[in-house]
Interface confidence: low
């Protein structure tokens, strides 16, 4: 099920887990083309970061919730 | 259950500072998010700032930094926050609150609030 | 910064009636991102509904959350005597994370 999953996600025009402009991403949300621009990231080291792959990952496939008593409906 | 346990009242002189703690128990410590927010009489609530504590990363309201630090301890599952140069305008009630996982869903625990009195 | 502005700032409802309150944000941001809290006087504040219309754990079915965009409400659709206390809304669409200036609910 999660081979097709991903089979069926990897056929989309833009990879879901390549940006952090969807409706599970948070605000600590950085896409990987801005980690690697040294002089944004020089300005934003100090805050800590999640990339796209982990939030899709965490929040829409496995679609956590905020505790096991606050369920989600993501 | 998750808990966050604050320190007690504090009363300090202008120009001192103060550490509030906020002791957890019944999650992960190192993986939520621990939101400080400041509440005022007539002034709601204000965010100050966010520390992960597995990390140690850090997002402060600009209008709180060099007023506020962040640390947190997992070994003892604590976070502190410490303000400096205490005036009258920092007199309020400091609550620590836990954020969701990897983001927002709301702050879904809160800490019992710690009441810091400024006076000379 | 996100402004949040509610209203009313204040008001007085009976027991039964319908309320809502208004929050709205200086600049669009999703859904995903605001939440409503509850404070009762000389307690913390307690998440009610997150994001936008989820109830929090053991809140009542008579609150309900609804908006997107630049306007959210909450609603409580018959008003009780244990309502009483001041609402909050809050977004943590960008940071700093910012609140609402609260609405003080009161019974007639």
């Known amino acids: 099920a999660w081979a097709t999953y991903y089979l069926f996600q990897s056929f989309q025009k833009e990879l879901p887990w390549a940006h952090c402009n969807h409706s599970w991403n948070t605000p600590h949300c950085m896409e990987d083309t801005m980690r690697k621009n040294k002089s944004v990231w020089i300005t934003i080291s100090s805050t800590n970061f999640t990339s796209p792959v982990i939030e899709f990952w965490e929040r829409n496939v496995l679609s956590l919730s905020p505790g096991i008593d606050h369920p989600g409906s993501l | 259950q998750v808990k966050l346990q604050q320190s007690g009242a504090e009363l300090m002189k202008p120009g001192a500072s103060v550490k509030i703690s906020c002791k957890a128990t019944g999650y992960t410590f190192s993986r939520y998010w621990i939101e400080w927010v400041k509440q005022r009489p007539g002034h709601g609530l204000e965010w100050i700032g966010e520390i992960l504590p597995g990390s140690g990363s850090t997002n402060y309201n600009e209008k709180f930094k060099g007023k506020a630090t962040f640390t947190a301890d997992t070994s003892s599952n604590t976070a502190y926050m410490q303000l400096s140069s205490l005036t009258s305008e920092d007199s309020a009630v400091y609550y620590c609150a836990r954020g969701g996982f990897l983001g927002h869903y709301g702050f879904a625990y809160w800490g019992q609030g710690t009441l810091v009195t400024v006076s000379a | 910064d996100i402004q949040l502005t509610q209203s009313p700032t204040t008001m007085a409802a009976s027991p039964g009636e319908k309320i809502t309150i208004t929050c709205s944000a200086s600049s669009s941001i999703s859904s995903n991102y605001l939440h409503w809290y509850q404070q009762k006087p000389g307690f913390s504040p307690k998440l009610l509904i997150y994001?936008?219309?989820n109830l929090a754990s053991g809140v009542p079915a008579r609150f309900s959350g609804s908006g997107s965009g630049t306007s959210y409400s909450l609603t409580i659709g018959t008003m009780e005597a244990e309502d009483v206390a001041t609402y909050y809304c809050?977004?943590?669409?960008?940071?700093?994370?910012?609140f609402g200036g609260g609405t003080k609910l009161e019974i007639k």
């Open positions: 994001r936008t219309s």
């Open positions: 809050q977004q943590g669409s960008s940071i700093p994370y910012t």
